[in-house]
Amino acid sequence: EVEKTACPSGKKAREIDESLIFYKKWELEACVDAALLATQMDRVNAIPFTYEQLDVLKHKLDELYPQGYPESVIQHLGYLFLKMSPEDIRKWNVTSLETLKALLEVNKGHEMSPQVATLIDRFVKGRGQLDKDTLDTLTAFYPGYLCSLSPEELSSVPPSSIWAVRPQDLDTCDPRQLDVLYPKARLAFQNMNGSEYFVKIQSFLGGAPTEDLKALSQQNVSMDLATFMKLRTDAVLPLTVAEVQKLLGPHVEGLKAEERHRPVRDWILRQRQDDLDTLGLGLQGGIPNGYLVLDLSMQEALS
């Protein structure tokens, strides 16, 4: 808390300009009118204030707007936004996409901070829905934002937004989310050549159905084990030993190390042991020779 002190003669700020960087903290508090600051917020960003000076400016705005800043001020906060707490931001009512973009730009290149998460939450709640323009903006700044959305919300994501997504952005997505994102990615990357297509689609394959995995197995893709282990179990189970061998290429040897883990474990249980033996990996647990496999799910459907 800065003590209230009278402004020295001749130092009263007439406008927000570079001369203020030479003011001590107490002088800023005493000599800068909060209303003047609010109307000239756009100038603050261009002036190399210290963090301590920015604290004073924030304090002045807090005093002027105890119920929360108006959007006219918020839009021009610039680097002062980094000084805001989530509690401050919860008091705001942000409705303009331009305001959102301006503040996201300040935090660009960094992980999504609690401040940004709160800002986005306030913005989306204020709008009442996640419209296409908002989604395009958010995925452009934070492609990983997709994994924080429900499958229902993801259904409105346009395929064009998928281009901005990078492998690391999907690290936190669960299978239900990938189920929605995969067909969009397929559409987005459809014009790419085979090898580039596979690398681009790879991080979305946790949502791929069996028929697409079968198709990929015919394309000499050499899927790595990390990707294979993220595939849907129900999509992997119907694959034959030959298809998995083609899908993984030289990485097929890695199945041995994963034989106790899903989906490999479940897949092994569905294969004939003599088919598994053709891999020469010593995989055990397949259906012994001479046994019949009854598909009980089909039987139930018929009865």
Partner: antibody, heavy 116, light 108 residues
Framework: QVQLQQSGAELMKPGASVKLSCKAT????????IEWVKQRPGHGLEWIGE????????NYNEKFKGKATFTADTSSNTAYMQLSSLTTEDSAIYYC?????????WGQGTLVTVSA | QIVLTQSPAIMSASLGERVTMTCTAS???????LHWYQQKPGSSPKLWTY???NLASGVPARFSGSGSGTSYSLTISSMEAEDAATYYC?????????FGGGTKLEIK
């Protein structure tokens, strides 16, 4: 076939700005990232940043924030990089490249020389 | 950011000799996103191998790539004169995208 044609060499004064262009042909311009890479004489390759023309989305290497600005004109299939407040350290060849899953196609490069 | 360190920085090899250059990443990179480029003086870089071990179009079969995690390599089974160039490894896995410092391969 895919081609990236870059603008010609530039001789600039310190403090000036320069805008380099990269015209893309032979593919859907809006659907691939355009990457910008710097190479100083005798040095390696340094990633500056990228732009996705379809959305205007940009990402910058922290080192080049404030130095480089990317834009794209989808009507002419051209990407631009503006370099501001030039110093002799900015003398280099600047490449644009098309990235899908890797930098598959490269422009011929633009040599920028900054000299008083 | 992921730092890629190439070694050696400069090497010379006789025609017909087997050549191996390495690229070490400061943190793990998926093999799908580790690529190599060849550059000759006065020319732009060219994609040479993609996703660690796949040869780009037109690259001779004497080249091969391998590796995983933090350790990758590019090998020429039998050096030829046209292979003299600088080779850069590159990760396109985690932004910012980075290149190794390059290995300059000369003819002995």
């Amino acid at each position: 076939q895919v081609q990236l044609q870059q603008s010609g060499a530039e001789l600039m004064k310190p403090g000036a700005s320069v805008k380099l262009s990269c015209k893309a042909t032979g593919y859907t311009f809006t659907g691939y990232w355009i990457e910008w890479v710097k190479q100083r004489p005798g040095h390696g390759l340094e990633w500056i940043g990228e732009i996705l023309p379809g959305s205007g989305s940009t990402n910058y290497n922290e080192k080049f924030k404030g130095k480089a600005t990317f834009t794209a004109d989808t009507s002419s299939n051209t990407a631009y990089m503006q370099l501001s407040s030039l110093t002799t350290e900015d003398s280099a060849i600047y490449y644009c490249a098309r990235a899908g899953a890797w930098f598959a196609y490269w422009g011929q490069g633009t040599l920028v020389t900054v000299s008083a | 950011q992921i730092v890629l360190t190439q070694s050696p920085a400069i090497m010379s090899a006789s025609l017909g000799e087997r050549v191996t250059m390495t690229c070490t990443a400061s943190s793990s990179v998926s093999s799908s996103y580790l690529h190599w480029y060849q550059q000759k003086p006065g020319s732009s870089p060219k994609l040479w191998t993609y996703s660690t071990s796949n040869l780009a179009s037109g690259v001779p079969a004497r080249f091969s790539g391998s590796g995983s995690g933090t350790s990758y390599s590019l090998t020429i089974s039998s050096m030829e004169a046209e292979d003299a160039a600088t080779y850069y490894c590159h990760q396109y896995h985690r932004s910012p995208w980075t290149f190794g410092g390059g290995t300059k391969l000369e003819i002995k």
